[in-house]
Amino acid sequence: NQDLPVIKCVLINHKNNDSSVGKSSSYPMVSESPEDLGCALRPQSSGTVYEAAAVEVDVSASITLQVLVDAPGNISCLWVFKHSSLNCQPHFDLQNRGVVSMVILKMTETQAGEYLLFIQSEATNYTILFTVSIRNTLLYTLRRPYFRKMENQDALVCISESVPEPIVEWVLCDSQGESCKEESPAVVKKEEKVLHELFGTDIRCCARNELGRECTRLFTIDLNQTPQTTLPQLFLKVGEPLWIRCKAVHVNHGFGLTWELENKALEEGNYFEMSTYSTNRTMIRILFAFVSSVARNDTGYYTCSSSKHPSQSALVTIVEKGFINATNSSEDYEIDQYEEFCFSVRFKAYPQIRCTWTFSRKSFPCEQKGLDNGYSISKFCNHKHQPGEYIFHAENDDAQFTKMFTLNIRRKPQVLAEASASQASCFSDGYPLPSWTWKKCSDKSPNCTEEITEGVWNRKANRKVFGQWVSSSTLNMSEAIKGFLVKCCAYNSLGTSCETILLNSPGPFPFIQDNIS
């Protein structure tokens, strides 16, 4: 009775990569640590069939299905997916186990299904079955967290109604400005829903699940800070909770804080106060203004006043529906090959947007930065001087926004040539779009100065590669030029580039490139 080989099946998740085809590979990419899939013999099956735990993969994720075989001797293998055989290259690891891998790059619907691996070893034959499906994230949600006061306690609860249930954390910072960036040492994170320490400079609550991370900042007016040049503005949708914190520090406890909406004191039950002494024995007071579910009539100027500090206000605007305000007209830019340049979009939006920059069907992460005037800005600098169309896309729960940019890189033409029995064609991608000349090289004109004007057909732009214009020129073959060398030249304000072509009978055509600045 032969002992069966020890089989281990693992899933390896990869950081996303640009390719998009599934392939069998013996050397997968560097990636996250492998996840065991508990390979087991399928019960009551004829033949030796191992089954791995079914795998759910996010759309566009890249994975490797891997089998480790602890069996003596060499192994040969074959992958089968949807009745197609795929090449299989086993190799051996340091523990002398046979390793077989199937890399699936950028998971799509068509790559979901059953992957069968047939293995033949010296002792036995067996089959390993992987079932790969796309994770149904349609039911997933990630909602921006909001605050509630904890019953009978001076504490805030952070709530995010999301699926799967999110991990909620408070992000606290006691410094000013730049030092409160996410990974700064001044930032403290607390993975809990309730927060009692409400005196910090900057308080945010974040919720994260498989869909990402969403944060809400506790809107704060600090009476010890110089007011912004423009009035701070807070947008909320009807039904959302309103929380504004007013904070003030004074040398002693002899001061009080009050909230007013349009010069009328807030009703009791719509505010609560907390105070503490700081390490240098100064008194910190905070006064929260809150409305559990805002209506249109909660719009207005909220003013926090102190008996010892100048008052400060914020404009609260209640909207029925979210919005994204920005100019959507397309913009064209022309830059030099080494010029530093960034695309930028300035917008005002509520709720906060999710955005992407796209070029050549590839998406890039999008960062947004809040400006003092209530606007935000997103910049994209990672264009690597590639000409073409760049798209900024933003959306929130209620609105969508798209803006197109065209980037042209000023450069000298580069010429490519091709020829057939009846014509010769030259292509160039320089910018500004080049003009063309054709010249004949002969005994009379060894320097190819004899210009050809007959049979030339120029196209300013014959194809658009990811938004990049390509200019072309075609010369129709005539008896007068057959058997001669001809030269096509593309020129613009930055220079000239030429290619020499032998106009022969059908057959291979030698091309000689000439670059003339």
Epitope: L11, S33, P34, E35, D36, L37, G38, A40, R42, P43, Q44, E51, A52, A53, A54, V55, E56, L129, T131, R135, P164, E165, E210
Partner: antibody, heavy 124, light 107 residues
Framework: QVTLKESGPVLVKPTETLTLTCTVS??????????VSWIRQPPGKTLEWLAH???????SYSTSLKSRLTISKDTSKSQVVLTMTNMDPVDTATYYC????????????????WGQGTLVTVSS | DIQMTQSPSSVSASVGDRVTITCRAS??????LAWYQQKPGKAPKRLIY???SLQSGVPSRFSGSGSGTEFTLTISSLQPEDFATYYC?????????FGGGTKVEIK
């Protein structure tokens, strides 16, 4: 390498609440075909299944202990937590966590990997 | 709850012996049964799942059979490392239940 590791107090007083944590590695609690169970074994006795939790947060409990048990998980920390209220000396046992795997042809992968167990003594 | 009755509760055997352990379910559990081996101070180790499928890496001297209510674990030729306690588990109905265990001792 699949591992499960139980952690928690060694000694608990009667009426107190026991909180045990199982930290897993080598597989993902996010995988819809993976679940984690808690099982206990009083000294010299047989094994008793307590509870398990699936990736979609579906939970099952032992009928006799249901009112005292709560199982939860934190996928990002790869942890499964079991709390057992109102502890009694008869709850003295080695507590294990173990993995369950589901396959296309059924959930037959019960307890293919176990933690090393943690002995919890209930005594005043 | 489903009762799993394991017999015998202990068995004395010598190296090379054939050992058979039985598990009876109080109602039909189809093939939803697993066998575990446990050594003192260690966690159980799965030997057989789905009544008759051998766990990868487990020697082929271990085999399982049966379905419905009657199940058997057989060790065809007992080895020194096989002296341990063996448990069956049914996972067809909640709550999951284990048998009382069978201790295999050296004769």
């Amino acid at each position: 390498q699949v591992t499960l590791k139980e952690s928690g107090p060694v000694l608990v007083k009667p009426t107190e609440t026991l909180t045990l944590t199982c930290t897993v590695s080598g597989f993902s609690l996010r995988n819809a075909r993976m679940a984690v169970s808690w099982i206990r074994q009083p000294p010299g006795k047989t094994l008793e299944w307590l509870a398990h939790i699936f990736s979609n947060d579906e939970k099952s409990y032992s009928t006799s202990l249901k009112s005292r048990l709560t199982i939860s998980k934190d996928t990002s920390k790869s942890q499964v937590v079991l709390t057992m209220t109102n502890m009694d000396p008869v709850d003295t046992a080695t507590y294990y966590c173990a993995r369950i795997v589901g396959y296309g042809s059924g959930w037959y992968g019960y307890f293919d990997y176990w933690g090393q167990g943690t002995l919890v003594t209930v005594s005043s | 709850d489903i009762q799993m009755t394991q017999s015998p509760s202990s068995v004395s055997a010598s190296v090379g012996d054939r050992v058979t352990i039985t598990c009876r379910a109080s109602q039909d559990i189809r093939y939803d049964l697993a066998w575990y081996q446990q050594k003192p101070g260690k966690a159980p180790k799965r030997l057989i799942y789905a009544a008759s499928s051998l766990q990868s890496g487990v020697p082929s001297r271990f085999s399982g059979s049966g379905s419905g209510t009657e199940f058997t674990l057989t060790i065809s030729s007992l080895q020194p490392e096989d002296f341990a306690t063996y448990y069956c588990l049914q996972h067809n109905f909640y709550p999951l239940t284990f048998g009382g265990g069978t201790k295999v001792e050296i004769k």
